[in-house]
Interface confidence: low
Amino acid sequence: ETVHCDLQPVGPERGEVTYTTSQVSKGCVAQAPNAILEVHVLFLEFPTGPSQLELTLQASKQNGTWPREVLLVLSVNSSVFLHLQALGIPLHLAYNSSLVTFQEPPGVNTTELPSFPKTQILEWAAERGPITSAAELNDPQSILLRLGQAQGSLSFCMLEASQDMGRTLEWRPRTPALVRGCHLEGVAGHKEAHILRVLPGHSAGPRTVTVKVELSCAPGDLDAVLILQGPPYVSWLIDANHNMQIWTTGEYSFKIFPEKNIRGFKLPDTPQGLLGEARMLNASIVASFVELPLASIVSLHASSCGGRLQTS
């Protein structure tokens, strides 16, 4: 049965979804267990010109010390104002000094990166040590690079399309996800549904997606259901500022009781099917409908509260 609900983009003042993901357009993770230098390469595309970027390097300490030096190769296509955090990491940074400006002195060894095409940059980096990870990111706002985390099965890194960087790299796109909404025809009342659909990633290991939900309305004003649909290997950790009905695939828990896993359901994996679930749950408004790549953290900010839906 077709559910009549014409999904249209919702104005940003009604709902915004940001997310952190390990999915990259191109990437690779390799193991270089005996290398004295751990090499990471980032190709960053900024389509709208000069940008700000927060780049954090995090070391997984072994016996209290970071055992290897790290070379980070930063290749950018336009001007970047960089906030770098790499506390206590013996870091060498290779970058184009005419394009990258630091928010504060980096306090690390720096090397000028030659103006090479991508393939040659990888070769240049590989001459300095085996590449542990490489990734191509489009318009990142922030990047977290975890050192010593590489668990790839590859012995060398070769860029491949649509890769999951696992725990090695997480990033947040600058552009929020497209949020759509609609009215469910023939359903009375003011119950609203927030639907988040997380698409399958390239690797299918167990994942927890943290979902932060912030709805700006008085607690008594809200009658809402949060529908979370994802691949079977995804479980959910929900951090919500309102009580609402929860309807998920896999298992979920709440941030206040993270140890208590609650079993979810097998939900449809199509937009139409999920709208049908919302209808079955007596929602009259789909206040937000979002489809995302496999993410680690998703933040939903909405101000609908069972009120009138405004689409842009």
């Epitope: 079977p232 309807w247 609650i262 079993r263 359901f265 097998k266």
Partner: antibody, heavy 118, light 106 residues
């Protein structure tokens, strides 16, 4: 149409072993979370074990009463669920149902009777 | 483990009667599922997620409740409704069933 057909039940002595099978059809078996539920004569339902799909790394779960004695497994190429029961006790006497968990146990087999008696 | 206590354990009623079966959990659960079983047959899914009727279940059945108290109601008992009804939760490990409520003909 979803069909679950159990087999392998029978009479066995305490301490003995038995292997139950459940042949599945009418749905994508490899995507399904599959369970065994049992019912002792004249008693209520008791969950025994679950095995999840390949996408969930075929994770397995057991009731305390059978942990260490029973092993759940599956062969997705044969659309078949198994329950290997070792060190059987008289209290394991029951009808064993193969079930599919979706939002709840939405499909059940007809059951196979296991009798543990000397 | 979460214990589910069904009451009454059995009841006698006439066709047309309104029947209510209770399921109380020893601690709060998110959802309750209900199954119907007739003698010598496998259980059938009846109500899922507390209030949703499984496929083919007549609308005279309804489910309600939250927290620790859940109810299955038959608004007007029909001859085919005489059976045993079980509640079940899996909000917390392990999955548990209630002891069952047998609905008999008066």
């Amino acid at each position: 149409e979803v069909q679950l057909v159990e087999s392998g039940g029978g009479l066995v002595k305490p301490g003995g072993s038995l292997r139950l099978s459940c042949a599945a059809s009418g749905f994508t078996f490899s995507d399904a979370w599959m369970d065994w539920v049992r019912q002792a004569p004249g008693k209520g339902l008791e969950w025994v074990s679950e095995i999840r799909s390949k996408a969930s790394n075929h994770a397995t779960y057991y009731a305390e009463s059978v942990k260490g004695r029973f092993t759940i497994s599956r062969d997705d190429s044969k659309n078949t669920l198994y329950l290997q029961m070792n060190s059987l006790k008289t209290e394991d006497t029951a009808v064993y149902y193969c079930t599919r968990w979706r939002r709840f146990f939405d499909s059940w087999g007809q059951g196979t009777l296991v009798t543990v008696s000397s | 483990d979460i214990q589910l206590t069904q009451s009454p354990s059995s009841l006698s009623a006439s066709v047309g009667d309104r029947v209510t079966i209770s399921c109380r959990a020893s601690s709060s659960v998110s959802y309750m599922h209900w199954y119907q079983q007739k003698p010598g047959k496998a259980p059938k899914p009846w109500i899922y997620a507390s209030s949703n009727l499984a496929s083919g279940v007549p609308s005279r059945f309804s489910g309600s409740g939250s927290g620790t108290d859940y109810t299955l109601t038959i608004s007007s008992l029909q001859p085919e409704d005489f059976a045993t009804y079980y509640c079940q939760q899996w909000s917390s490990n392990p999955l548990t069933f209630g002891g069952g409520t047998k609905v008999e003909i008066k």
